[in-house]
């Protein structure tokens, strides 16, 4: 028999998103500076480029955990019954949500470790020394940029909390742990906490973006930065989740 | 039925400690400088203040895992028998030790991640650049402060080892893992390694404190720094554990 | 009965390797500078020395997971049958491979955390400030060393990916997780991914080494640096694995 049948779809999707994001980031971060000003930024590939790919894959996969639930609710509302069978593709997707979630967590953890490794890199050390040299040359006593400090303190903190919640979801997916929970407890963690972690991940990305939305320098060769693309699907899911949470629709769904 | 009945008490206690520590740290780190010299340190809230709360909660919860055992031993010694029923509150507490321990580990991991994120923050980068500028201004060739270096090398190392041991306790709490152990093996890990991690956590906090016990600057508005409050309960537990480990008392308890 | 019978051998081996590596690193990093130029580097013990020990133990234990399989294959090829009993020591070793692997992962995680803690240490801060001061004094505009940047970006990235794969192996070792997998799935993860992580760990070490193989300064008191010793066994295992993977030998083994 086949190996890991339930993992095929999530791994395929993850691989596609990862490949596309890698090529897209490579184009923007490495090929563009090479083509336009002969700057060689190939050293960025092993960590900086990879670490643009990881959060993109992670947040997209997490959105794909909650998107089929949204679609299913819309389908049920449209059909007016829960007894009509879902289309095959949606059924298949619904059954692989756990795998999507675990993959999302895997990529999120990798993203965290890659991020934490930033200041230990030689590239960062050399940049710091050069910045210090420039600060002395410019006779600039204070390097502090208040809004930039705020931006990073907030998005790092939210990212850690989001990852922590995602970790709880992952732990409760361990068979013997989920077996020790009642169905209501398991459902509570997976649905409520899952959406909270998606929300935190989205806010984390938006605060990372900060004022870059209107920064023309971000639009390399007229392409938007990855975070803009990354937050699109999560925002869609969160909006629909919020709409379906409205009392009128919520009652209708519960009736069905 | 209720959701997560065994988690109610630990989560309540954790929430209370976290809230109080947050407000206390906020008072000392943010409100005091604002009130006394109009210094705006609000940027400290998302990471620095939170990361004073996390270890406080973690070490307190870990102490609360081993405190009921100490109380139970004292009650048994006082009663001279193990057949007399424990008071209801102690019984309830004894049954939620696993949850206290897992919550302690959760907060410890968060504390570790927050701590590891320190050097990647913009605030740290800007401070580093300012320090470098100032060192040049002062014409100071060597910034090295030996005792400070030692302090940090030791407390970081002990913290990591303590966390590693706590991780072993957490892993052996996974139902299928604990099922694969004999009762003696499980008890050995949970009791012996647990106390070792509490000891390491306490030493970690004490070495973090170093010479701050006698530094008048630490006593903001006559309030002691958080680490002083944090180590109180763990030290009490460790002292009682040591006393109950004395041959004379140990024999008595084993007899009972 | 005995506590943790299957863990005796792995823990003994790990303790021996750790102790020898610790003493060896102490000799090279602390005692040598003290004896030859009265430089006191004792502050290196809690983190820097320990973090030379951890990867050494980790990669050796990981190699020891796959070495008995290689030996078993050679024994079977030599005997021409799989029905002849393995020697007792090999049998015992084969049965403790899971424990060797989990210990390897434990040390790898510790190595990662210790490594990530480097830039948050005071010793690193003070060194950075001194380097910045020297750069200004030398009027050196650019500190960048391209090959050094490349070296670190690559070895850090490979190390993280290797650790991630090792984590997958560890997770699938949780009884309830392994129970949910078919034997073929479990075997696929443990054999294929295991060898991949050993390969990545070895490349990680080799790229860490970079051009240090021919750097005479690395040979303190004529002793090779730890990474040279560390990669020996993994390379042996990988070479033998590759040889046994050759079509001619692979067919022979499958026949047996």
């Amino acid at each position: 028999q086949e190996l890991f049948p339930q993992w095929h779809l999530p791994i395929k999707i993850a691989a596609i998103i990862a490949s596309l994001t890698f090529l897209y980031t490579l184009l923007r971060e490495v090929i563009h500076p090479l083509a336009t000003s002969h700057q060689q930024y190939f050293y960025k590939i092993p960590i900086l480029v990879i670490n643009k790919v990881l959060p993109m894959v992670s947040i997209t996969l997490l959105a794909l955990v909650y998107l089929p639930g949204v679609i299913a609710a819309i389908v049920q509302l449209h059909n007016g019954t829960k007894y009509k069978k879902f289309p095959h593709w949606l059924d298949k997707w619904m059954l692989t949500r756990k795998q999507f979630g675990l993959l999302s967590f895997f990529f999120a953890v990798l993203h965290a470790i890659y991020s934490l490794s930033y200041p230990m890199r030689r590239s960062y050390r050399y940049k710091l020394l050069n910045w210090a040299y420039q600060q002395v040359q410019q006779n600039k006593e204070d390097a502090w940029i208040e809004h930039d400090v705020w931006r990073m303190e907030i998005y790092v903190s939210l990212g850690i909390v989001g990852l922590a919640i995602l970790a709880l979801l992952a732990v409760t997916s361990i068979p013997s742990v989920s077996d020790s929970l009642t169905w209501r407890e398991f459902h509570y963690i997976q649905s409520k906490l899952g959406i909270v972690s998606l929300l935190l991940g989205t806010i984390h990305a938006l605060i990372f973006a900060w004022n870059k939305w209107i920064d023309i320098k971000q639009f390399v060769w007229y392409t938007p930065p990855t975070f803009m693309i990354a937050v699109f699907l999560p925002i869609v899911v969160l909006i629909f989740k919020s709409i379906l949470f409205l009392p009128c629709l919520r009652k209708k769904i519960l009736k069905i | 039925q209720e959701l997560f009945p065994q988690w109610h008490l630990p989560i309540k206690i954790a929430a209370i400690i976290a809230s109080l520590t947050f407000l206390y740290t906020l008072l000392r780190e943010v409100i005091h400088p604002l009130a006394t010299s109009h210094q705006q340190y609000f940027y400290k809230i998302p990471i620095l203040v939170i990361n004073k709360v996390l270890p406080m909660v973690s070490i307190t919860l870990l102490a609360l895992v081993y405190l009921p055992g100490v109380i139970a031993a004292i009650v048994q010694l006082h009663n001279g028998t193990k057949y007399k029923k424990f008071p209801h509150w102690l019984d309830k507490w004894m049954l939620t030790r696993k949850q206290f321990g897992l919550l302690s580990f959760f907060f410890a991991v968060l504390h570790a991640i927050y701590s590891l994120s320190y050097p990647m923050r913009r605030s740290y980068r800007y401070k580093l650049l300012n320090w470098a500028y100032q060192q040049v201004q002062q014409n100071k060739e060597d910034a090295w402060i030996e005792h400070d270096v030692w302090r940090m090398e030791i407390y970081v190392s002990l913290g990591i080892v303590g966390l590693a041991i706590l991780a072993l306790l957490a892993v052996t709490s996974i139902p299928s893992v604990s099922d694969s152990l004999t009762w003696r093996e499980f008890h050995y890990i949970q009791s012996k390694l647990g106390i070792v991690s509490l000891l390491l956590g306490t030493i970690h906090a004490l070495i973090f404190a170093w010479n701050k016990w006698i530094d008048i600057k630490q006593f903001v508005w006559y309030t002691p720094p958080t680490f002083m409050i944090a180590v109180f309960l763990p030290i009490v537990v460790l002292i009682f554990k040591s006393i109950l480990f004395l041959p004379c008392l140990r024999k008595k308890i084993l007899k009972i | 009965q005995e506590l943790f019978p299957q863990w005796h051998l792995p823990i003994k081996i790990a303790a021996i390797i750790a102790s020898l590596t610790f003493l060896y690193t102490l000799l090279r990093e602390v005692i040598h500078p003290l004896a030859t130029s009265h430089q006191q580097y004792f502050y290196k013990i809690p983190i820097l020395v320990i973090n030379k020990v951890l990867p050494m133990v980790s990669i050796t234990l990981l190699a020891l997971v796959y070495l008995p399989g290689v030996i078993a294959a050679i024994v079977q090829l030599h005997n021409g049958t799989k029905y002849k009993k393995f020697p007792h020591w090999l049998d015992k070793w084969m049965l403790t491979r899971k424990q060797f692997g989990l210990l390897s992962f434990f040390f790898a995680v510790l190595h990662a955390i210790y490594s990530l803690s480097y830039p948050m240490r005071r010793s690193y801060r003070y060194k950075l400030l001194n380097w910045a001061y020297q750069q200004v004094q030398q009027n050196k505009e650019d500190a960048w060393i391209e090959h050094d940047v490349w070296r670190m970006e690559i070895y850090v990235s490979l190390g993280i990916v290797g650790l991630a794969i090792l984590a997958l192996l560890a997770v699938t070792s949780i009884p309830s997780v392994s129970d949910s997998l078919t034997w073929r799935e479990f075997h696929y993860i443990q054999s294929k991914l295991g060898i991949v992580s050993l390969l990545l760990g070895t490349i990680h070490a080799l790229i860490f080494a970079w051009n240090k193989w021919i750097d005479i300064k690395q040979f303190v008191w004529y002793t090779p640096p730890t990474f040279m010793i560390a990669v020996f066994l993994p390379i042996v295992v990988l070479i033998f694995k590759s040889i046994l993977f050759l079509p001619c030998l692979r067919k022979k083994i499958l026949k047996i």
Epitope: E141, D142, A143, W144, E146 | P33, S37, H38, Q39, Q40, Y41, S123, Y126, K127, N130, W131, Q134, Q137, Q138, N139, K140, E141, D142 | -
Partner: antibody, heavy 124, light 113 residues
């Protein structure tokens, strides 16, 4: 009680040299403090000359064109100001003053203790 | 170098008066990283050494009467004596310790009216 006592002032000819001393009592000069020299020309304001930190690093006012050197003798708990190539405009009362040593939180500190000063007159 | 400009250069006041001395720096003395203004105020009486009154622009040195207060941030600072006492007649200096070289204001002489 911390006390700083300057000495070594007096009349010196232009182009000459002079060494001022500042004896500290009640505190070790190698502890958590940096030590400054400040001068005040007759009827004028204060001018910072330079400082020596607890680690021994020094910094000077660029306007003095490297004519002045600050040093210390730890065993005598005394710091010194060596003045070379003296000019008439160097005539002033020279003070030594203490400031808390640089730290990574508060950076610099104000000068909290001053000596009574010693008069240096540069005249032919 | 950072220029420190004090005003007025001298003033006459009576006992009990409220006195305000201003000090302007040629650049900001506020370190944004720790939100401190690196400005000190000193009092000097004839034939005596200066005495520290205020540091970090607004923090009173221990032992200094509460009638002395400092305020301001960035480049504009003020020393206020809420009710002038006979022993307060002296010259007052502001000083920046934001960077090297340390620089002082030219001084403000407070005389009896």
């Amino acid at each position: 009680e911390v006390q700083l006592v300057e000495s070594g002032g007096g009349l010196v000819q232009p182009g000459g040299s002079l060494r001022l001393s500042c004896a500290a009592s009640g505190y070790s000069i190698t502890s958590d403090y940096a030590w400054n020299w400040i001068r005040q020309a007759p009827g004028k304001g204060l001018e910072w000359v330079g400082y020596i930190s607890n680690s021994g690093s020094t910094s000077y006012n660029p306007s003095l064109k490297s004519r002045f050197t600050i040093s210390r003798d730890n065993s005598k708990n005394t710091l010194y100001l060596q003045m070379n190539s003296l000019r008439a405009e160097d005539t002033a009362v020279y003070y030594c003053a203490r400031e808390r040593n640089y730290d990574y939180d508060d950076y610099y500190y104000a000068m909290d203790y001053w000596g009574q000063g010693t008069l240096v007159t540069v005249s032919s | 170098d950072i220029q420190m400009t004090q005003s007025p250069s001298s003033l006459s006041a009576s006992v009990g008066d409220r006195v305000t001395i201003t000090c302007k720096s040629s650049q900001s003395l506020l370190y944004r990283s720790n939100q401190k203004n690196y400005l000190a105020w000193y009092q000097q009486k004839p034939g005596k050494a200066p005495k520290l009154l205020i540091y970090w622009a607004s923090t009173r040195e221990s032992g200094v009467p509460s009638r002395f207060s400092g305020s301001g941030s960035g480049t504009d600072f003020t020393l206020t004596i809420s009710s002038l006492q006979p022993e307060d007649f002296a010259t007052y200096y502001c000083q920046q310790y934001y960077n090297y070289p340390r620089t002082f204001g030219q001084g403000t002489k407070v005389e009896i009216k």
